[in-house]
Interface confidence: medium
């Protein structure tokens, strides 16, 4: 079973401290080699993937991950129980919902089991690393002759999210963007009845419950108006682009070690 786990790149909003221990030696030993950085993302507060670049190791190494929460009731060191693999080498760890405490400082330690002194520790603020699922169930309703209202749902995290709405008409080359607060509702006051509109939304865990920088995936687009992509080259281009973006996202493959919680995979 090859289940792909998608993990966005970058962890710029994490507060990171590294502690590297090396054996004193005259020649360069394995223990002096830096360990790869661990990047963690909390997907919709349903599970968390902490991943690292296993290919940065000079030779294939099954690095191990331990974690705990600093200055809390959950400060007991825990072993990863659910490793992610890339080409049969550990490249990440998946933590389930019950193991995630957003508002406690998460400490993650990567270690080379063959060189126990070779280890790196990072401290992360998980509330800044939440990535929500894409908004769902987009609906449009006409408020008046020329006014449209767009509504959508987010699974679980409603009041914690801000949103970005993009819309364009058939013949627009680029999107118009509008930020929306936690109310997940957007009104377009002036609609041209002769044009077909496309709307899409993405969401971010910011600012009420955290300060995440990463947006969700875009929602599936919703359309208003008469034309179809068969009549409009820009909509065809948009649909074809979406296929490209999906393929690009599937570029870096990471496989799950076990079959549990597969329904939690990061969907598009």
């Amino acid at each position: 079973l090859n289940t792909t786990i998608l993990t966005p790149n970058g962890n710029e909003d994490a507060t990171t401290d590294f502690f590297l221990t090396s054996m004193p030696t005259d020649s360069l030993s394995v223990s002096t080699l830096p360990l790869p950085e661990v990047q963690c993302f909390v997907f919709n507060v349903e599970y968390m993937n902490c991943t690292w670049n296993s290919s940065s190791e000079p030779q294939p190494t099954n690095l191990t991950l331990h974690y705990w929460y600093k200055n809390s009731d959950n400060d007991k060191v825990q072993k990863c129980s659910h490793y992610l693999f890339s080409e049969e080498i550990t490249s990440g760890c998946q933590l389930q919902k019950k193991e995630i405490h957003l508002y406690q400082t998460f400490v993650v330690q990567l270690q080379d089991p063959r060189e126990p002194r070779r280890q790196a520790t990072q401290m992360l603020k998980l509330q800044n690393l939440v990535i929500p699922w894409a908004p769902e169930n987009l609906t449009l309703r006409k408020l008046s002759e020329s006014q449209l209202e767009l509504n959508w749902n987010n699974r679980f995290l409603n009041h914690c999210l801000e949103h970005l709405v993009q819309y364009r008409t058939d013949w627009d080359h680029s999107w118009t963007e509008q930020s929306v607060d936690y109310r997940h509702k957007f009104s377009l006051p002036s609609v041209d009845g002769q044009k077909r509109y496309t709307f899409r939304v993405r969401s971010r865990f910011n600012p009420l419950c955290g300060s995440a920088q990463h947006w969700s995936e875009w929602s599936h687009p919703i359309h208003w108006g008469s034309n179809s992509s068969k009549e409009n080259p820009f909509l065809f281009a948009l649909e074809a682009e979406q296929k490209l973006i999906s393929e690009e996202d599937l570029g870096g493959e990471q496989k799950l070690i076990s079959e549990e919680d597969l329904h939690h995979h990061h969907h598009h």
Epitope: H173, K230, F236, E239, K243, L244
Partner: antibody
Framework: QVQLVESGGGLVKPGGSLRLSCEAS????????MTWIRQAPGKGLEWIAY????????RYADSVKGRFSTSRDNAKNSLSLQMNSLRAEDTAVYYC???????WGQGTLVTVSS | DIQLTQSPSFLSASVGDRVTITCWAS??????LVWYQQKPGKAPNLLIY???ALQSGVPSRFSGSGSGTEFTLTISSLQPEDFASYYC?????????FGQGTKVEIK
Amino acid sequence: QVQLVESGGGLVKPGGSLRLSCEASGFTFNDFYMTWIRQAPGKGLEWIAYISKSGDKMRYADSVKGRFSTSRDNAKNSLSLQMNSLRAEDTAVYYCARFYGDIWGQGTLVTVSS
Amino acid sequence: DIQLTQSPSFLSASVGDRVTITCWASQDISSFLVWYQQKPGKAPNLLIYAASALQSGVPSRFSGSGSGTEFTLTISSLQPEDFASYYCEQLNNYPWTFGQGTKVEIK
């Protein structure tokens, strides 16, 4: 007027390098994925590369992977194709195009021969 | 990779003829198929996108149909300027691939 203009083709020896340029005008360049397609003399069309709108994602055909690289400068409305380790079988007319082929450049001929 | 096979490779026809070119895909590509016309020494020109949508400025004698794995380009009444090569291309899967082309010549 919407157009793409390629330049940089010419004669090069096997193993040599060449850089093709594609200048865009008449449309919002950074709103479009862009592609490179080539056509060997008397042969059909072969897609060789695409680049995303912001230039952060590129894909290449197996026939050129590791030898060719494409990049773009949205501020200058320009696209380029760097071709290294050229082979005789790379001889072709090279076209840049908007990503689903609605606008093409006029093409530039690259000849790889000793 | 998805293979596109065009048929016929060569076609001899007269002005006024109805001409049909077929493009088969080795797997389902939905409607992500385009058709081009190319004249000697020129860049290809987009005729049809999304399998059946006529590109702006293309004469209505050109039409496309099909979905999935079988597609056709039809020229309802061949004109002198239509003698050229025609290519299909799929955009459903990377790498994008072209058919081998169909050359339409004067009988």
